[in-house]
């Protein structure tokens, strides 16, 4: 028998520095977690103790903090090289800055293979990107070899900016011939490493003949066997065992997100490459693990540029940006409109001639807007200003909801109106009218939404049975501020870009902004 140790990360999202327990900015260092310096300590410790170790990343290193905003992926290549990752799969967020923003900083600089079997380049891009990412890579590990085959969410064109010269194929259809090829090349130990979410990971384990282990990402799934060490609630045991269609037991793993845990899986193979046993657990990277001094020194060196960036002007406002709780928790506020407009703008994807865009709607809890921005400072807007407005380090995500769920969400928005509570929704692509004289749960008297399947966008009444795409904060997607109906009833959830980054990019693009209060949210009394 031959034993392999798989160390894995996924959805690190630019958390190069240690973070607080909830993966936001580290405040009290003695209680902080994760970060590449601490990760390196643990990885090195395992590499020294065990003979056959692979360090893999399942995508979405890009996007999430000011590190990505400033360094645009160069930081990913640099620190992943320093940690000596063995392979990485492309995630949807790796395309956030377009294909060029992937090729130059990451694909050309990475000293490890970057993989995806279901992304096919065409046209002029095919020769430009050839060999920079691969469908699979065979890695020597001790006296054996292991094949790693990559995959990426086929929803990426709707979630990011891969352009028109990359085709995202069905994962299972694309993986099977690559695995067949590896098997025929005498590779009898094969890991599928990819970024399509836990449901697809399980399907790959079930359907793709010859895959021995699946290491996934995208859904931020936390798996654990035994008592979990922090706040995350396990979605299942680690590893999660899937019985394949040909009767094999295939371990599937994922390691939550944000570099908080290091996935640790031990696999035992027989001489023909069959999995005999698998066990492990994610390792919580808490403060009991010291940060590696040399990586930490490098982080501090790279950090200097971030501090300078946060005070630079992104753009100007010529109006007061009202982000006060007195406004945003009670009525339409122009800061809410600005943020929602930025959220929609960030999700412009012309992927179908029938649709002007795939999504037109935004909702945003008023309680998530934490500060106004005064225009009387020469109109200057900095990253620092935006960090005061959006201090939680969240993301603006894409969900699919039924109209009936949206109606419930808007009822919840005003169910206890007047108490300055955070659930009051700011909107984009939505016209809502409330009648507060009616009883809670029955206060939405008009709810019109902007069409997407139209050449001239216009507002139509919400249909209860129709499925709509909506951009919203991850906080709401996870049921925050009492929006349990969103969490319980959402049909799809894809995590998006860092909130501040979305707004800062929009302001930089617009150069001068002047958002108004324009009647998106209205109040009425009497019959409708």
């Amino acid at each position: 028998a031959w034993e392999l140790t798989i160390l894995h990360t996924n959805d690190v999202h630019s958390r190069l520095e240690q973070t607080s327990e909830d993966s936001s900015k580290c405040v009290n260092a003695s209680r902080c977690m994760g970060g590449v310096a601490r990760l390196f300590t643990k990885v090195q410790q395992i590499r020294r103790a065990e003979p056959n170790v692979l360090l893999l990343d399942a995508g979405d290193q890009y996007q999430g903090t000011i590190w990505f905003t400033v360094y645009k992926g160069a930081e990913v290549a640099h620190f992943m090289n320093a940690l000596r990752y063995d392979a990485m799969a492309l995630g949807n967020h790796e395309f956030d800055n377009g294909v060029e923003g992937l090729i130059e900083p990451l694909l050309k600089e990475a000293k490890f293979p970057i993989l995806s079997a279901n992304i096919k380049a065409k046209g002029p891009l095919a020769s430009q990107i050839s060999g920079l990412y691969l469908p699979y890579k065979v890695l020597p590990v001790g006296d054996e070899v292991v094949g790693i085959v990559g995959y990426t969410s086929k929803e990426t064109p709707f979630l990011s900016n891969p352009g028109t010269n990359l085709v995202f194929e069905d994962e299972i259809t694309a993986l099977q011939p690559e695995v067949d090829k590896l098997k025929t090349l005498n590779v009898n130990k094969i890991i599928a490493l990819g970024h399509s979410g836990f449901e697809m990971d399980k399907l790959i384990a079930q359907k793709v003949r010859g895959v021995d282990v699946v290491v996934g990402g995208h859904s931020n799934t936390f798996l654990y066997t035994g008592n979990p060490p922090s706040k995350e609630v396990p979605a299942g045991k680690y590893p999660f065992i899937v019985t394949s269609d040909d009767g094999r037991k295939v371990p599937v793993v994922q390691a939550y997100a944000f570099g908080k845990y290091l996935g640790y899986l031990k696999i035992e193979f027989d001489e023909r490459g069959n999995v005999i046993s698998s066990h492990g657990n994610p390792i919580l990277l808490n403060s009991s693990i010291p940060e590696d001094p040399s990586i930490k020194a490098d982080i501090n060196k790279w950090r200097i540029k971030l501090d300078n960036y946060s005070t630079q002007e992104l753009g100007k406002t010529i109006v007061y940006l009202d982000g006060s709780s007195q406004s945003c928790r009670f009525r339409e506020c122009n800061m809410g409109n600005l943020i929602c407009d930025a959220m929609i703008n960030n999700n412009l994807r012309h992927t179908d001639e029938m649709f002007w865009n795939h999504v037109s709607m935004c909702i945003l809890n008023g309680g998530g807007i934490r500060s106004p921005i005064d225009e009387r400072n020469n109109g200057t807007i900095t990253w620092e200003n935006l960090a005061a407005v959006l201090p939680f380090g969240g993301t603006f995500d894409l969900v699919q909801l039924k109209g009936s769920t949206l109606k419930k969400a808007f009822e919840h928005s005003v169910h206890r109106y007047g108490q300055s509570t955070g659930e009051f929704l700011q909107v984009g692509g939505i016209h809502v009218v409330y009648d507060l004289s009616r009883k809670p749960g029955d206060r939405v008297v008009k709810l019109d939404v902007l069409c997407t399947k139209c050449r001239v966008p216009s507002y139509d009444p919400l249909k209860m049975d129709e499925v709509y795409k909506v951009i919203l904060p991850n906080f709401l997607a996870n049921g925050g501020d009492g929006f349990q109906m969103i969490k319980d009833e959402l049909l799809r959830h894809d995590s998006g870009d860092q909130d501040i980054n979305v707004v800062s990019t929009y302001i930089s693009k617009m150069k001068v902004i002047y958002p108004a209060v324009e009647g998106r949210i209205k109040f009425s009394t009497g019959s409708h």
């Epitope: 020597p140 090829k181 025929t184 090349l185």
Partner: antibody
Framework: EVQLLESGGGVVQPGRSLRLSCAAS????????MHWVRQAPGKGLEWVAV????????YYADSVKGRFTISRDNSKNTLYLQMNSLRAEDTAVYYC?????????????WGQGTMVTVSS | DIQLTQSPSSVSASVGDRVTITCRAS??????LAWYQQKPGKAPKLLIY???SLQSGVPSRFSGSGSGTDFTLTISSLQPEDFATYYC?????????FGGGTKVEIK
């Protein structure tokens, strides 16, 4: 003794067919991917085709794709190469070779070869 | 397809000489290269696999090195039985390809 023995070669007219066989002995045949490699007179080696241990996955050189078919019968420890629509440029010594037990494929056992001459 | 270019195409050497043959791949093939020796009228014989691993039963005067795109076969002290043609072969991807061969002749 580990051995591969090809047969079935000969002289054939262009456009006709020929079937080569390779009998394996001295090892567990169904544990190995098997290959055909050819060598035109006075020329270098050219890989022709592979079939995996189970006989499911097959890959071919572009020069023979659509004309040649590789197959195996694990119960008889025998590898085959069905060659259709033969051309003059298919004239060569055809070797069957074992693909080794491990990656990377390295042909660790070769047969003695069988000569195929395509001529009118 | 991955092309393999061998050089030189032929080399004249004497018994006891050190002989070096190179093989260059058209793209990165990691360490997935093998070397063969072939004598006239005979089947090829495997010498080196995975760029540097010596096949069982092959004399230790044969050695291989390299990774990525550049590879070398070295015969440290040429013996009379070593006069033959040598081929490199990649197994990184299908189609499997061979180099054009290097003929080692007696000076």
């Amino acid at each position: 003794e580990v051995q591969l023995l090809e047969s079935g070669g000969g002289v054939v007219q262009p456009g006709r067919s020929l079937r080569l066989s390779c009998a394996a002995s001295g090892f567990t045949f169904n544990f190995y991917g098997m290959h055909w490699v050819r060598q035109a007179p006075g020329k270098g080696l050219e890989w022709v085709a592979v079939i995996n241990d189970e006989g499911i996955n097959k890959y071919y050189a572009d020069s023979v794709k659509g004309r040649f078919t590789i197959s195996r019968d694990n119960s008889k420890n025998t590898l085959y190469l069905q060659m259709n629509s033969l051309r003059a440029e298919d004239t060569a010594v055809y070797y069957c070779a074992r693909g080794g037990a491990r990656y990377p494929i390295a042909f660790d056992i070769w047969g003695q070869g069988t000569m195929v001459t395509v001529s009118s | 397809d991955i092309q393999l270019t061998q050089s030189p195409s032929s080399v004249s050497a004497s018994v006891g000489d050190r002989v070096t043959i190179t093989c260059r791949a058209s793209q990165d093939i990691s360490s997935w290269l093998a070397w063969y020796q072939q004598k006239p009228g005979k089947a090829p014989k495997l010498l080196i696999y995975a760029a540097s691993s010596l096949q069982s039963g092959v004399p230790s005067r044969f050695s291989g090195s390299g990774s990525g795109t550049d590879f070398t076969l070295t015969i440290s002290s040429l013996q009379p039985e070593d006069f033959a043609t040598y081929y490199c072969q990649q197994a990184n991807d299908f189609p499997i390809t061979f180099g054009g061969g290097t003929k080692v002749e007696i000076k």
